[in-house]
Amino acid sequence: KKEDGESTAPTARPKVLRCKCHHHCPEDSVNNICSTDGYCFTMIEEDDSGTPVVTSGCLGLEGSDFQCRDTPIPHQRRSIECCTERNECNKDLHPTLPPLKDRDFVDGPIHHK
């Protein structure tokens, strides 16, 4: 989701935005700081073993509107939050995993009778 009621239409920022990056640092990052013309993000998702993994970093303006929309993906629990209001704003983003649905239990590795 986007924070602070930002509009969904991506508009070019007049200046570069610095974001914290973790597990998602591009080659041009330095000291776990990346730069972007788009958004900072923090995302939580389950890995293959069902363990929650938090990643953060930069999303370029191109395509970031779609990526920040947090559209549900079948059979995948994940949540993303995006921000632009200040440098390293994603330090303060704490997305949570969406609740398990009944069918997630059925389709998952553990079956409840």
Epitope: P14, K15, V16, D28, I33, D37, C58, E62, N87
Partner: antibody
Framework: QVQLQQPGADLVKPGTSVKLSCKAS????????MQWVKQRPGQGLEWIGE????????MYNQKFKGKATLTVDTSSSTAYMQLSSLTSEDSAVYYC?????????WGQGTTLTVSS | DVVMTQTPLSLPVSLGDQASISCRSS???????????LHWYLQKAGQSPKLLIY???NRFSGVPDRFSGSGSGTDFTLKISRVEAEDLGVYFC?????????FGSGTKLEIK
């Protein structure tokens, strides 16, 4: 029009500190980063660091960490760079420059002379 | 740090000639956003640098169309199609893809 006003020159003694100023006008001060660049004769241009006036977030060239401190006063649209423990190596022209994704406007530069 | 190597160091030209300046970077300047942050500046004697070209090939406002920039990755060129007296000075390339931002050592354009 965009203007970045810097004092023309400053003469200081070795071991002291100096605070250089850069007054911005003609644009929204908080909408762009302010960078500082050092130029010594025959040594080219060196990027010192930058500050985002909207949140005072700074990034420094590792080489100038501990030497330069960048600050802003948004009420007067002025950026400052303090240089400490000055030596003759700090004698140079110092430019402030407006930065979005590239520097588009430069100040006229302050010639700093460190001499006893 | 990314090293920016400019050639030649000095470029003697006759007025009306074409001039070409090369700038090579020690790393690719393609940013993770897909942009290439390579820029060209002209510094005349006793003045501050002035922006000519930003992001490889975009002329800054008020810059004559005799100035053009090209290149990609690590290899970039500034061309002046017909040199005029007001073009004399030192040309710098600069990158703002990688922190710390770095500059070329400069190319002095002078009259033959």
């Amino acid at each position: 029009q965009v203007q970045l006003q810097q004092p023309g020159a400053d003469l200081v003694k070795p071991g002291t500190s100096v605070k250089l100023s850069c007054k911005a006008s003609g644009y929204t001060f908080t909408s762009y980063w302010m960078q500082w660049v050092k130029q010594r004769p025959g040594q080219g241009l060196e990027w010192i660091g930058e500050i985002d006036p909207s949140d005072t977030y700074t990034m420094y060239n590792q080489k100038f960490k501990g030497k330069a401190t960048l600050t802003v006063d948004t009420s007067s649209s002025t950026a400052y760079m303090q240089l400490s423990s000055l030596t003759s190596e700090d004698s140079a022209v110092y430019y402030c420059a407006r930065f979005g994704y590239y520097v588009d406007y430069w100040g006229q530069g302050t010639t700093l002379t460190v001499s006893s | 740090d990314v090293v920016m190597t400019q050639t030649p160091l000095s470029l003697p030209v006759s007025l009306g000639d074409q001039a070409s300046i090369s700038c090579r970077s020690s790393q690719s300047l393609v940013h993770s956003t897909g942009n290439t942050y390579l820029h060209w500046y002209l510094q005349k004697a006793g003045q501050s640098p002035k922006l000519l070209i930003y992001k490889v090939s975009n002329r800054f406002s008020g810059v004559p169309d005799r100035f053009s920039g090209s290149g990609s990755g690590t290899d970039f060129t500034l061309k002046i199609s017909r040199v005029e007296a007001e073009d004399l000075g030192v040309y710098f390339c600069s990158q703002s893809t990688h922190v710390p931002f770095t500059f070329g050592s400069g190319t002095k354009l002078e009259i033959k």
